[in-house]
Interface confidence: medium
């Protein structure tokens, strides 16, 4: 018996078709992915074979301006248009808390959405009970197939899903589900979730009974033989992991963005074993037409967006100085906006001891690419904001050592005055430069806001100690000249889009007058 | 089968170097930090430092700093730590370890360790 | 560097009883409300075996006769009902701060 897998995972927003690099499309005839691309495609394959599962491994929340906009209603709508047989929950699908998980989506989607290691508690229990489910059951031809659902277990840390749901770790949690359907005679099992492909490659060695794992959440791309684009596949597709019982599992992942429709076909024995698996992603570039009545669709959607984009967000009475003459040269007040932004979006009440679990933002001065002028009324929109930081990237949270940090200090000034990015912005942080010092010994003091205070004070950074910041993705890969943070960083986890961090902060401010305060001084 | 292995002994004269070898098989090498504990006979265990396959990037306990180099060559899915200089506080089990997950420092595969015996 | 100590150094229980080792460190361990304190057991000639992670997880095919509990700078390792199989040294290690430190290790002896 055969089947086909079709899968999606950290699609972000990415309704509209998009650039290569999965930014804004800006010339149509060389753009790729989009819903209206992927219901072409699907429907093409469909059509040609009869046992098709339409699948997502999470993170449809929080990526561009339609969720800012919609907030998931239309993950909803367009996922229903497109007729998913099942999602899994992302981290990501918690970053408006709860309350915008359950009601633009888990109330809205006509298909099962899963996760066998969220357990809710508390009065959440009851009002969150069958709307998310561990498993679910799914007719395919004369078959029927499970799919068990898994989360990252990093949530609470990575977006806001509140006090009464509890991340079980996964392996743990979903033993129990595989077991439960295999004493219901379901002997084909995919785990679809959402954890990375270090815990996808775990739980096809561990967890007794999955036949396949389809994941996401590390943008991983896999693919056998040449690669169709610019991604660089970090190993084949489907990878196979050997599993502890002796059965060999592939693992899946499709990169990200809509890119690609993952394309994955199993065939399997009278008693549910794995015999074969092959395929590879589908790069949905211009060569697959765009459907039209999904296409008509997302233009009726798209008119609010317009009409967003222009709208007062909030106000400054004071002018927003995102210069370059500034922001690679000084403290620029824009930096701080920013990086106060940053950090108002990562708090997550750790415990008593911790007032946030993050205290310390860094910011390339060159990823600031405009100010904003208070004398427009000061009024800011969207438009404003994708002028100030116009590469669609995202805010990300890593953990470095306290040396890396330094690292990272002396690089922002090693070649001062010739107006480069690497000039770094901050919040949470007080940095002294001496530049008569030479490159690599000019910081001559760097001191970091505490966490664990219930009064936020600065101390000196401790070389051993390891610390959490915030800080564009961008940064976090390396550019810049920030290698040492790429080399070094003890833990990286993507955050949201760097527009919607900073509109929501002015949102909810609603008059902004961010001041040039000494985070950073020269001696 | 996630399998870390190691060669048993290596003898050696004090003063001279060492470069000790771990062999990953079974998962993808470049996608987890190997670490390197050191423990002398009858005595506790000791973190020495890791390394970051996919490009390289070390941590290191000050104390092993002019001590242990740590190398890896993806070709071969290997770990490499070159200890110098050594002396008869250099004799003990050194073992290679990986976490459960990219970013875990917990260990939860070892290799079975080499035994270091400096001595002329 | 976070020193930890383990108590006792050596203790013997006999079969079916319990065994408590405590891990003491020199400053907290715990990170964003979560203690970052593991538990491993050695025998004789062997490498360490990871049993508890993050102070109370039970690592995939360990016993539950196995748990650990504490926070901040106090860690307990406890085993109930201790079985001849248990005779070990037993570590904690942190990972709070570099560089890991582990415990000086108890050993574990079956009457």
């Known amino acids: 018996w055969e089947l086909t897998i079709l899968h999606t995972n950290d699609v972000h927003s990415r309704l509209e078709q998009t650039s290569e690099d999965s930014s804004k499309c800006v010339n149509a005839s060389r753009c790729m992915g989009g819903v209206a691309r992927l219901f072409t495609k699907v429907q093409q394959i469909r059509r040609a074979e009869p046992n098709v599962l339409l699948l997502d491994a999470g993170d449809q929340y929080q990526g561009t301006i339609w969720f800012t906009v919609y907030k998931g209603a239309e993950v909803a709508h367009f996922m229903n248009a497109l007729r998913y047989d099942a999602m899994a929950l992302g981290n990501h699908e918690f970053d408006n808390g709860v309350e915008g998980l359950i009601e633009p989506l888990l109330k809205e989607a006509k298909f099962p959405i899963l996760s066998a290691n969220i357990k809710a508690k508390g009065p959440l229990a009851s009002q969150i009970s069958g709307l998310y489910l561990p498993y679910k059951v799914l007719p395919v031809g004369d078959e029927v197939v499970g799919i068990v659902g898994y989360t990252s277990k990093e949530t609470p840390f990575l977006s806001n899903p509140g006090t009464n749901l509890v991340f079980e770790d996964e392996i743990t949690a979903l033993q129990p589900e595989v077991d439960k359907l295999k004493t219901l005679n379901v002997n084909k099992i995919i785990a679809l979730g959402h954890s990375g492909f270090e815990t996808d490659k775990l739980i096809a060695q561990k967890v007794r009974g999955v036949d396949v794992v389809v994941g996401g959440h590390s943008n991983t791309f896999l693919y056998t033989g040449n690669p169709p684009s610019k991604e660089v596949p970090a190993g084949k597709y489907p990878f196979i992991v050997t599993s502890d019982d002796g059965r060999k599992v592939p693992v899946v992942q499709a990169y990200a963005f809509g890119k690609y429709l993952g394309y994955l076909k199993i065939e399997f024995d009278e008693r549910g074993n794995v015999i074969s698996s092959h395929g590879n992603p589908i790069l949905l570039n211009s060569s697959i037409p765009e459907d039209p009545s999904i296409k008509a669709d997302i233009n009726k959607w798209r008119i609010k967006l317009d009409n967003y984009s222009t709208q007062e967000l909030g106000k400054t009475i004071v002018y927003l100085d995102g210069s370059s003459q500034s922001c690679r040269f000084r403290e620029c007040n824009m930096g701080n906006l920013i990086c106060d932004a940053m950090i108002n979006n990562n708090l997550r009440h750790a415990d008593e001891m911790f007032w946030n679990h993050v205290s310390m933002c860094i910011l390339n001065g060159g990823g600031i690419r405009s100010p904003i002028d208070e004398r427009n009324n000061g009024t800011i929109t969207w438009e404003n904001l994708a002028a100030v930081l116009p590469f669609g990237g995202t805010f990300d949270l890593v953990q470095l050592k306290g040396s890396t940090l330094k690292k990272a200090f002396e690089h922002s000034v090693h070649r001062y005055g010739q107006s480069t990015g690497e000039f770094l912005q901050v919040g949470g942080i007080h940095v002294v430069y001496d530049l008569s010092r030479k490159p690599g010994d000019r910081v001559v003091k760097l001191d970091v806001l505490c966490t664990k205070c219930r009064v936020p004070s600065y101390d000196p950074l401790k070389m051993d100690e390891i610390y959490k910041v915030i800080l564009p993705n961008f940064l976090a890969n390396g550019g810049d000249g920030f290698q040492m943070i790429k080399d070094e960083l003890l833990r990286h986890d993507s955050g949201d889009q760097d527009i919607n961090v900073v509109s929501t902060y002015i949102s909810k401010m609603k008059v902004i007058y961010p001041a040039v305060e000494g985070r950073i001084k020269f001696s | 089968q996630v399998q870390l292995q190691q060669p048993g002994t290596e003898l050696v004269n004090p003063g001279a170097s060492v470069k000790l070898s771990c062999k990953a098989s079974?998962?993808?090498?470049?996608?987890?930090?190997m670490h390197w504990v050191k423990q002398r006979p009858g005595q506790g265990l000791e973190w020495i430092g890791n390394?970051?396959?996919?490009?390289?990037?070390?941590h290191y306990n000050e104390k092993f700093n002019n001590k242990a180099t740590l190398t890896v060559d993806k070709s071969s899915s290997t770990a490499y730590m070159q200890l110098s200089s050594l002396t008869s506080e250099d004799s003990a089990v050194f073992y290679c370890?990986?976490?459960?997950?990219?970013?875990?420092?917990?260990?939860?595969?070892w290799g079975t360790g080499t035994t270091v015996t400096v001595s002329s | 560097d976070i020193v930890l100590t383990q108590s006792p150094a050596s203790l013997a229980v006999s079969l079916g009883q319990r065994a408590i080792i405590s891990c003491k460190a020199s400053?907290?361990?715990?990170?964003?409300?979560?203690?970052?304190m593991h538990w491993y057991q050695q025998k004789p000639g062997q490498q360490p075996k990871l049993l508890i992670y993050?102070?109370?997880n039970l690592e995939a095919g360990i016993p539950t006769r196995f748990s650990g509990s504490g926070s901040r700078t106090d860690f307990t390792l406890n085993i109930h009902p201790v079985e001849e199989d248990d005779a070990a040294t037993y570590y904690c290690?942190?990972?709070?701060?570099?560089?890991?430190?582990f415990g000086g290790g108890t050993k574990l002896e079956i009457k």
């Open positions: 370890a990986r976490g459960d997950y990219a970013y875990d420092w917990y260990f939860t595969v």
């Open positions: 079974g998962y993808t090498f470049t996608s987890y930090w």
């Open positions: 390394i970051n396959p996919s490009n390289g990037g070390t």
């Open positions: 400053q907290s361990v715990s990170f964003a409300g979560t203690g970052l």
């Open positions: 993050r102070v109370s």
């Open positions: 290690q942190q990972n709070r701060e570099f560089p890991w430190t």
